[in-house]
Interface confidence: low
């Protein structure tokens, strides 16, 4: 077969080939940020000639052109400056309102390198209508100027701009416009991952609810749906495997879908996941009718085994057939469960379509969506039962109109996106499901995204401040209780002067709480074994503080999960009937268990908890500590089985002021406290006033560093005695 010519360079840019110079290969151009390629791509035809998709004239030289943002077409009740035909990257446009009108949205907007304006649509509103003035986004024209109940407004885009969002919106009885805000965008524009992740995540979190079924009261979170034990989510993942998707990109589609599956199973809901790959024909790798679709391992395994070569005989993009296979799956499930049953009617459905182009065969995908809406009886009352997310990847041949037509339209949410490449997709899926924004007391959720603050990563972490000496640390285990070390309180029991500093999104310094009561383990006595030559003994080094007020849950303040509770059981996605022993087996399941604690400066440091035989050798070192334990004959007199041991090899050691803080580990994107920092043989902060400065112990140090943490699995009776009304404990 002939190959296509190689004289296809683009000045100032680069290109990639999906299948070399052979017929069927897609050549994709890319340019530095702030520029876009024209044309975006070419296809090698069987004749050995390059064809530019959508082009009418012969092959033109590929060039990188400057990105520009669309100009306002009209701005009601105000003025904007400067008035240009379009705006360069970095250019600003400013808005002012006439007297009697108030500016809503962004007074100044900047053109970003992806051809999109930052900020929000500026609107000059006098509050006269039943609904607020819906505004006119940049580049759009609106018809309809009445904002009463039932009134409609329509939008279109000027020149060659593409409309995403709703072209028609209606003022509803609740004073909210139907659908989603229309945006006019350049055909070559795309979304940045940092914009998509929160937008997609907000919508998805609304749909999931991620509500803790053990909660006594429920707080609403926008359009948050309470999918509890009776509720169920069907998630359908549709992965484009057509010719223009390279094998490596398909791998990233799979990886992204795996991330999505991983995250979705970390929510406390019942979920079934379907996996469908498609090119000319769809291939169902996992159906929601299969029991395995409820099992994360099975779903990820079927994703892992999704093979790019499954579709090598049919390389078109038949999005209709892919969506129709979802429809058929729904139809079968409806028949199985019975159309009238709650079991069928209470299932929520979410479809995520990952594609790199427009459908080019099989009819309009919109038809399949209409069938899906019909079978699910989607109307204004049941709008929450279906969400379709259409995600285009690669700016080349993605059809904005089609994506927009397929994506759901819901107020304040976006369901259609175009990302620059598969790496951006991966980034989005990594950060989209951020449950840390939820307001209920769901436990063990930390924000894991790269730009999160230390407190957002470990929102349970608190500082306990006496008025004089060294501080201690602790962990929120509910909205009013803090778990910490008893030895923090050994100098008298007047806690009226103490403060507990809890994370607060409004202040980088946190918020201070008074202590209503301190419950210190009666078994703790640092001098209990002094007459045996053990100068300090830290058995039963555990205390609980009840705060004077409840902490408002936020991104910066949230309890950690305590093992052996129903709350932790849900987070671990373990079956009902699990025991405390099961939790210990699952969490402390290796000779060396990676765990963390929080440093004085708030950062998360790594340790390895030694179990079994390794615990014994970890603890043995204490016999070399002659100052504190001059005549020690049996290490177990000091290191009882109440303690976890760390401090070997590459472990960090806690500093003195870090006592009482949580020793925790991560499972399924949730965090579980297995211990609390108690005592150690080495203080890495000794002699340093700077809390960012920690000194590693010299290799020759005798004894070498060792750190001991109260093992919460060994303190169960005491915890249950004092927290029985606060947490739901499992049987031992």
């Amino acid at each position: 077969a002939p190959s296509c010519p190689q004289n296809v360079n683009i000045s100032g840019g680069t290109f990639t080939l999906s299948h070399g110079w052979a017929p069927g290969s897609l050549l994709t151009y890319s340019c530095p940020q702030g520029l876009y390629p024209s044309p975006a791509s070419r296809l090698c035809k069987s004749s050995g000639q390059w064809q530019t998709p959508g082009a009418t004239r012969s092959l033109s030289k590929a060039v990188c052109k400057p990105v520009r943002c669309p100009a306002p077409v009209s701005f009601e009740n105000g003025i904007y400056t400067p008035r240009l035909g379009s705006y360069p990257v970095g250019g600003n446009v400013s808005f002012e309102c006439e007297d009697g009108f108030i500016l809503r949205g962004s007074p100044v907007r900047q053109c970003r390198p992806n051809g999109m304006w930052d900020g929000e649509t500026a609107v000059c509103d006098n509050g006269a209508g039943h609904c607020p003035n819906p505004g006119i986004s940049l580049g759009a024209v609106r018809t309809g100027f009445r904002f009463g109940h039932g009134d409609k407004v329509r939008y279109r885009c000027s020149s060659n701009l593409v409309l995403t969002g709703s072209s028609e919106r209606e003022c509803q009885g609740n004073g909210v416009w139907s659908g989603t805000e229309p945006i006019c965008r350049q055909p070559y524009s795309y979304d940045f991952p940092e914009d998509v992740a929160p937008a997609l995540g907000t919508s998805f979190s609304h749909m999931l609810g991620a509500t803790n079924p053990t909660q006594k009261t429920k707080e609403s979170l926008g359009r948050k749906i309470q999918i509890q034990r009776s509720g169920h989510l069907n998630l359908y993942l549709l992965l484009d495997c057509s010719q223009s998707v390279s094998e490596n990109d398909f791998l990233i589609f799979k990886e992204s879908a795996s991330l999505m599956v991983d995250r979705i199973f970390s929510f406390e809901i019942n979920v079934s996941v379907a996996i469908i790959t498609f090119a000319s024909e769809p291939k169902v790798l996992m159906s929601v009718l299969n029991d395995n679709s409820r099992d994360m391992t099975e779903v990820i395994s079927s994703l892992e085994n999704a093979n790019y070569k499954d579709h090598e005989n049919g390389t078109g993009t038949n999005t209709y057939a892919a969506l129709n296979s979802v429809y058929l799956m729904m139809n079968n499930q409806m028949r199985l469960l019975g159309m009238e049953t709650m079991a069928w009617q209470e299932i929520r459905h979410a479809i995520i379509l990952l594609t790199d182009g427009k459908s080019n065969m099989g009819g309009s995908p919109k038809t399949a969506v209409d069938h899906i809406r019909e079978i699910l009886n989607i109307n204004q009352k049941r709008n929450d039962y279906l969400d379709i997310y259409a995600i285009g990847v690669g700016k080349l041949d993605v059809d904005w109109r089609e994506l927009n037509e397929l994506g759901s339209k819901k107020d304040g949410e976006r369901h259609a996106f175009i990302l620059q490449d598969t790496k951006a997709l991966h980034q989005v899926f990594e950060h989209m499901l951020d449950v840390s924004k939820l307001t209920d007391t769901i436990c063990g959720v930390g924000n894991m995204s790269a730009n999160a603050s230390d407190q957002e990563r470990t929102p349970w972490h608190v500082t306990i401040k006496p008025k004089s000496q060294e501080t201690c640390r602790g962990a929120l285990i509910s909205d009013q209780w803090v778990l910490t070390a008893a030895h923090c309180f050994r100098d008298g029991n007047d806690h009226s002067l103490w403060r507990v500093n809890v994370g607060d999104p409004k202040s980088q310094w946190g918020k201070e709480f008074l202590i209503e009561k301190a419950v210190i383990s009666p078994g703790f006595d640092v001098f209990a074994k002094k007459n045996q030559g053990i100068l300090e003994f830290y058995g039963d080094d555990i205390a609980l503080l009840k705060l004077a007020q409840k902490v408002k849950m936020s991104t910066h303040a949230r309890p950690i999960c305590l093992p052996c509770t129903m709350e932790a059981n849900l987070a671990l996605r373990r079956p009902q009937g699990s025991t405390c022993r099961d939790h210990e087996n699952e969490l402390l399941n290796k000779q060396s268990v990676p765990a963390h604690f929080v440093a004085l400066n708030g950062s998360k440091l790594n340790i390895n908890l030694k179990m079994g035989v390794e615990w014994t050798s970890c603890a043995e070192v204490v016999s070399q500590e002659k100052t504190m334990f001059p005549n020690l004959t049996d290490v177990r007199e000091v290191v009882t089985d109440q303690f976890l041991c760390s401090g070997t090899q590459e472990d960090e050691s806690p500093c003195k002021g870090e006592s009482g803080g949580a020793v925790f580990l991560e499972r399924r994107f949730r965090f579980f406290q297995v211990g609390l920092v108690s005592w150690g043989l080495y203080n890495p902060c000794l002699g340093s006033a700077d809390k960012n400065s920690r000194k590693r112990a010299p290799r020759s140090k005798v004894p070498p560093p060792r750190d001991f943490h109260i093992n919460l699995f060994r303190m169960q009776p005491w915890l249950r005695q004092h927290l029985g009304d606060v947490l739901n404990f499992l049987p031992l």
Epitope: E247, L251, T297, E298, E304, D582, E586
Partner: antibody
Framework: QLQLQESGPGLVKSSETLSLTCTVS??????????WGWIRQPPGKGLEWIGT???????YYNPSLKSRGTISVGTSKNQFSLKLSSVTAADTAVFYC??????????WGQGTLVTVSS | SYDLSQPLSVSVALGQTARITCGGN??????VHWYQQRPGQAPVLVIY???NRPSGIPERFSGSNSGNTATLTISRGQGGDEADYYC?????????FGGGTKLTVL
């Protein structure tokens, strides 16, 4: 912590069926987080995958074994087992049982040597 | 069926960097996992999904995967790194191991 231990006869006659059992401790074998498998290593040679079983009972086998292998799970005793029929001297190997999460083998038994004698 | 080829042996001077390759047709489209097997012991996972390190594995171990070759890199080689190293992929529901590479630390 999850621990795996192989057990079974160290010597099997040619043409007979090799039977091995793997006992899992430190966690339930029925957990949907894990899958289980057998991997063997002939003396002085590399690793060869025999097969995998998921908690749902679904199995995958190495095509080169030509349907000689059967893996099954006994949840009551927290065990899974391997039967390899019609063995020959070429089946002499250290047999490892292993457990995994996702797509890797994260937990391994210490291995048991099985010799096939003629 | 899919084949993975590894060099039989690789040597590295103490403190230097060792690179062990794993070749396979278009291997970059697959996820590659690496195991270390010390003499007389069971294998241990050292890298999963091309470049991710399980907890407890030193930062000296890293992985990459591109084109037809996946690579395990061990920097600042130590005596304890002397072992056999195996790459592994999944292909059409089957698990495939490479033939193994013996790493010698000089």
């Amino acid at each position: 912590q999850l621990q795996l231990q192989e057990s079974g006869p160290g010597l099997v006659k040619s043409s007979e069926t090799l039977s091995l059992t793997c006992t899992v401790s430190g966690g339930p074998i029925s957990s949907s987080s894990y899958y289980w498998g057998w991997i063997r290593q002939p003396p002085g040679k590399g690793l060869e995958w025999i097969g995998t079983i998921y908690y749902s009972g679904r199995t995958y086998y190495n095509p080169s074994l030509k349907s000689r292998g059967t893996i099954s799970v006994g949840t009551s005793k927290n065990q899974f087992s391997l039967k390899l029929s019609s063995v020959t001297a070429a089946d002499t190997a250290v047999f490892y049982c292993a457990g995994g999460v996702g797509v890797t083998w994260d937990y391994w038994g210490q291995g048991t040597l099985v010799t096939v004698s003629s | 069926s899919y084949d993975l080829s590894q060099p039989l042996s690789v040597s590295v001077a103490l403190g230097q960097t060792a690179r062990i390759t794993c070749g396979g047709n278009d291997i970059e489209s697959k996820n590659v996992h690496w195991y270390q097997q010390r003499p007389g012991q069971a294998p241990v996972l050292v890298i999963y999904r091309n470049s991710n390190r399980p907890s407890g594995i030193p930062e000296r171990f890293s992985g990459s995967n591109s084109g037809n070759t996946a690579t395990l890199t061990i920097s600042r080689g130590q005596g304890g790194d002397e072992a056999d190293y195996y790459c592994q992929v999944w292909d059409s529901s089957t698990v495939i191991f490479g033939g193994g590479t013996k790493l010698t630390v000089l």
